[in-house]
Amino acid sequence: VPLDPISVSNSSSQIILKWKPPSDPNGNITHYLVFWERQAEDSELFELDYCLKGLKLPSRTWSPPFESEDSQKHNQSEYEDSAGECCSCPKTDSQILKELEESSFRKTFEDYLHNVVFVPRKTSSGTGAEDPRPSRKRRSLGDVGNVTVAVPTVAAFPNTSSTSVPTSPEEHRPFEKVVNKESLVISGLRHFTGYRIELQACNQDTPEERCSVAAYVSARTMPEAKADDIVGPVTHEIFENNVVHLMWQEPKEPNGLIVLYEVSYRRYGDEELHLCVSRKHFALERGCRLRGLSPGNYSVRIRATSLAGNGSWTEPTYFYVTDYLDVPSNIAK
């Protein structure tokens, strides 16, 4: 298994992956395989009303760049525990002995996985788009005896920003073949999106590829600067009872998802008032309604808040509310 995989993001569309070679490889490592897949945002984010008092916005940070080659790991492998900022204590004799036993067990277990669970797959020429793994068929565990084998699960890969659709192991996933180095820059990713990255070490290229159990690491790309800005005009409709319906388009490709909108409005000469519009509220009105407005000139600005923070305020929109009682209407019917 490749050791200490670290993933960081240096832009809104790239993740840099670094790792160390296996400590006890079975033969020579000829190449590594890196697979990645987009992770669905936690469904809880769609449920909560972030306009409720006391409810903090979810903390979703991207994976910051490396400080130095061997500095604190920002994103730990799923095999590792975060050690904080502290230095590790000197190892005792028993710890060293235990690690040697674990190393030996790991090597034996990998051999077992290769020989019993997996049929070696035919090599796949080319990189970047085709997942060669469908040709590696899983043997039935029925004839293996009483053994429990942990097989990595496939994370959700939604085709939209919400409903997650699990990908089957037979489905193609993007991957890259890495030769003669222990790092990879994964490009062409979606901004402010979590990715699950799978890394395998392989000790044979042709005719049959033999690869290790996967190490996993997660990372989130950086936010896109203007992705949370409301594009297009803020429109309004004034109804007879001094109700103003404001409408705007939601950002097309936000950073993660929009959790709320802030509406800031003021009557000329008065102080600014603020209104919070939740995802749920926006879904019904495609905007919001300002009720019981006093006659006068108004200006309104709106901004979206995503998982990455606030977008920019829109340019002010202006409207005039007349004195409702002075306007002849056919209300009394």
């Epitope: 909560l48 919400s162 409709e237 007879e240 749920k280 495609r286 209300i331």
Partner: antibody, heavy 118, light 110 residues
Framework: QMQLVQSGAEVKKPGESLKISCKGS????????IGWVRQMPGKGLEWMGI????????RYSPSFQGQVTISADKSISTAYLQWSSLKVSDTAMYYC???????????WGQGTMVTVSS | SYVLTQPPSASGTPGQRVTISCSGS????????VTWYQQLPGAAPKLLIY???QRPSGVPDRFSGSRSGTSASLAISGLQSEDEADYFC???????????FGGGTQLTVL
């Protein structure tokens, strides 16, 4: 493409229970309200209720409150309309619709015909 | 009984202009957007006009909507045989906290 697909026609007896479904696809199901509308034979449209699948917030028309239950399972992008005890007067076509533009159903299911007779 | 009032029927000859009215009250049309739906025989309703006068993509510009006070109207110009359908107006109702519909207008192309 974006669509709502409803379950098939049902023929039931008075007093029986029933649950019909409406499955959304091609869009983010959790982010849009889904409504149920009744159309009795030869009649107009009547709003029954709406649900927000993101948190299952449900609002009923006073005429249907206590008569039906609206629910959703966001894990399978499906909304439901159910009766615990059907009446002959429940015979109608039932439509689900997605609210997208302000308060308007922009996508409709094909309808589920429910026939209740003894 | 339906909250919004529509004429039960309307008719016109091909090429003609037909208008369908819809009247409500201050709690619905008076303070909310009007929506129009078309329902062809044996089919599900289809969104025709939203936010009083907007057409979804794919709806011909022969269809237009307007709203004034507590009334609204749908106009169909250059009437065609395929326009023969039921037309329903709808609006959100603040007192009901949900949408209300008209009883529908059956349009016949003579």
């Amino acid at each position: 493409q974006m669509q709502l697909v409803q379950s098939g026609a049902e023929v039931k007896k008075p007093g029986e229970s029933l649950k019909i479904s409406c499955k959304g696809s091609g869009y983010s199901f959790t982010g849009y309200w889904i409504g149920w509308v009744r159309q009795m034979p030869g009649k107009g449209l009547e709003w029954m209720g709406i649900i927000y699948p993101g948190d299952s917030d449900t609002r009923y028309s006073p005429s249907f409150q206590g008569q039906v239950t609206i629910s959703a399972d966001k894990s399978i992008s499906t909304a439901y309309l159910q009766w615990s005890s059907l009446k002959v007067s429940d015979t109608a076509m039932y439509y689900c619709g997605r609210i997208s533009t302000p308060y308007a159903f922009d996508i409709w299911g094909q309808g589920t015909m429910v026939t209740v007779s003894s | 009984s339906y909250v919004l009032t529509q004429p039960p029927s309307a008719s016109g000859t091909p090429g003609q202009r037909v208008t369908i009215s819809c009247s409500g009250s201050n709690s619905n049309i008076g303070s909310n957007f009007v929506t129009w739906y078309q329902q062809l025989p044996g089919a599900a309703p289809k969104l025709l006009i939203y936010t009083n006068s907007q057409r979804p993509s794919g709806v011909p510009d022969r269809f237009s909507g307007s709203r004034s006070g507590t009334s609204a109207s749908l106009a169909i110009s250059g009437l065609q045989s395929e326009d023969e359908a039921d037309y329903f107006c709808a609006a959100w109702d603040d007192s009901l906290n949900g949408p209300v519909f008209g009883g529908g207008t059956q349009l016949t192309v003579l």
